[in-house]
């Protein structure tokens, strides 16, 4: 029987920057049962806090309300693992909230195939952004990616959209069902996982372009 | 404890090209981003890039955009800073370093000398 | 991008003397979200660079309460309030605010 081995605050995880999320892993519990405490300050402060929260992040985790996250503020952060035989603690871990988001998928994603009299056919897409984000005070810039394949296809093809909502593709192939999918990350964060896939359908007529990339 | 061992110095010819690698320790490397840093012999440091080991998103200093490349293996919790074209200009310590979840570096590599010379 | 200007270029100070450092930065460094970005990294002779200041004026962990910083928008200052021999080496002002991150050119300081 042994102290607890050290843990790690391995993931720190914000949707929106008003609210966030850490994760930690335990070390080995050297054979006995092992409580975890997350403890933290503020940049500035002395007074070390207490997780306000261990439920809601599922487990060995600590959430930080609304009330308890400050963009402003840096929090440094350690966990402590405790049994009979003694204690170890992790790292410690310097939490900027801007640095930590990962946003949900983009909202909405429409795909039509447009076929104007002069000019070549394309595959023309938009989306929103995620309901949670509030792009309008400029905290955030969000950028996006496509990625779209045929529906058999292994390999998907991805491209970058930069900051627009919408894109066109010239070049696809005629006949195929297309699955197309968006993502999005703020400029200091973490890509959003993948939208659900919209399908669309490519005529059998789609004239093929010659160039490969897309146009803003 | 966190450890970030670079690989060792290497001489190159001008136009040639050198890989720095950077392997991490002590933590779990996909979840920090690792940053490139540069000091030539007597002079100050300049910011090369940044990758996310979990999705190999890249972020590059235009003056190295084209002629940097970062990389991660994650099997082995390795990054790596190839460097192309390269000129007498380049010959430095190349540094790697890590953030926590923030914009300043807490850990740092020992460096890799990299000469260029003819 | 951000230029950062460092003065002095060298300061020789006595033990236990207080001493200071310059950092300027060619455009405001305070973020979109408020915050500013700008931290001080001591690299003694022949090791890396190691934090010593973040934010401004928030010590890193280990990091001696004689070491301050302070400052706002383009005008940055670190105080060291007592030298001791430990403290030789090449201080560095960095920004990372704007991409791409820059650092000051350094101020050597020595212990006369």
């Known amino acids: 029987q042994l102290p607890p081995g050290k843990p790690e605050i391995f993931k720190c995880r914000s949707p929106n920057k008003e609210t966030f999320t850490c994760w930690w892993r335990p070390g080995t519990d050297g054979g006995l049962p092992t409580n975890y405490s997350l403890t933290y300050h503020r940049e500035g402060e002395t007074l070390m806090h207490e997780c306000p929260d261990y439920i809601t992040g599922g487990p060995n985790s600590c959430h930080f309300g609304k009330q308890y996250t400050s963009m402003w503020r840096t929090y440094v952060m350690m966990v402590n693992a405790t049994n009979q035989m003694g204690s170890s603690f992790s790292d410690e871990l310097y939490v900027d909230v801007t640095y930590i988001v990962q946003p949900d998928p983009p909202l909405e994603l429409t795909v039509e195939v447009k076929q104007p009299e002069d000019r070549k056919p394309y595959l023309w897409m938009k989306w929103s952004p995620p309901t949670l984000i509030d792009l309008k005070t400029g905290w955030f810039t969000l950028l996006y990616e496509i990625r779209l394949k045929p529906e058999k296809a292994a390999e998907w093809e991805t491209h970058f959209a930069g900051q627009q909502t919408e894109f066109k593709i010239l070049s696809l192939h005629p006949g195929q069902k297309y699955l197309v999918q968006v993502r999005c990350k703020p400029d200091h964060g973490y890509w959003s996982a993948w939208s659900p896939a919209t399908f669309i359908q490519i005529p059998s007529d789609f004239i093929m372009n010659d160039h490969h990339h897309h146009h803003h | 404890e966190v450890q970030l061992v670079q690989s060792g110095a290497e001489v190159k010819k001008p136009g040639s090209s050198v890989k720095v690698s950077c392997k991490a320790s002590g933590y779990t490397f996909t979840s920090f981003w690792m940053h490139w840093v540069r000091q030539a012999p007597g002079q100050g440091l300049e910011w090369i890039g940044v990758?996310?080991?979990?999705?190999?998103?890249?972020n590059y200093n235009q003056k190295f955009k084209g002629r940097a490349t970062l990389t991660v293996d994650e099997s082995s919790s390795t990054a790596y800073m190839e460097l192309s074209s390269l000129r007498s200009e380049d010959t430095a310590v190349y540094y790697c370093?890590?953030?926590?979840?923030?914009?300043?570096?807490?850990?740092w590599g020992q460096g890799t000398l990299v000469t260029v010379s003819s | 991008d951000i230029v950062m200007t460092q003065t002095p270029l060298s300061l020789s100070v006595t033990p236990g003397q207080p001493a200071s450092i310059s950092c300027r930065s060619s455009q405001r460094l305070v973020h979109s979200n408020g915050n500013t970005y700008l931290h001080w990294y001591l690299q003694k002779p022949g090791q890396s660079p190691q934090l010593l200041i973040y934010?401004?004026?928030n010590r890193f962990s280990g990091v001696p309460d004689r070491f301050s910083g302070s400052g706002s928008g383009t005008d940055f200052t670190l105080k060291i309030s007592r030298v001791e021999a430990e403290d030789v080496g090449v201080y560095y002002c960095s920004q990372s605010t704007h991409v791409p991150w820059t650092f000051g050119g350094g101020t050597k300081v020595e212990i006369k």
């Open positions: 990758i996310d080991p979990s999705d190999t998103y890249t």
């Open positions: 934010k401004v004026s």
């Open positions: 370093a890590r953030g926590d979840y923030s914009n300043w570096f807490t850990y």
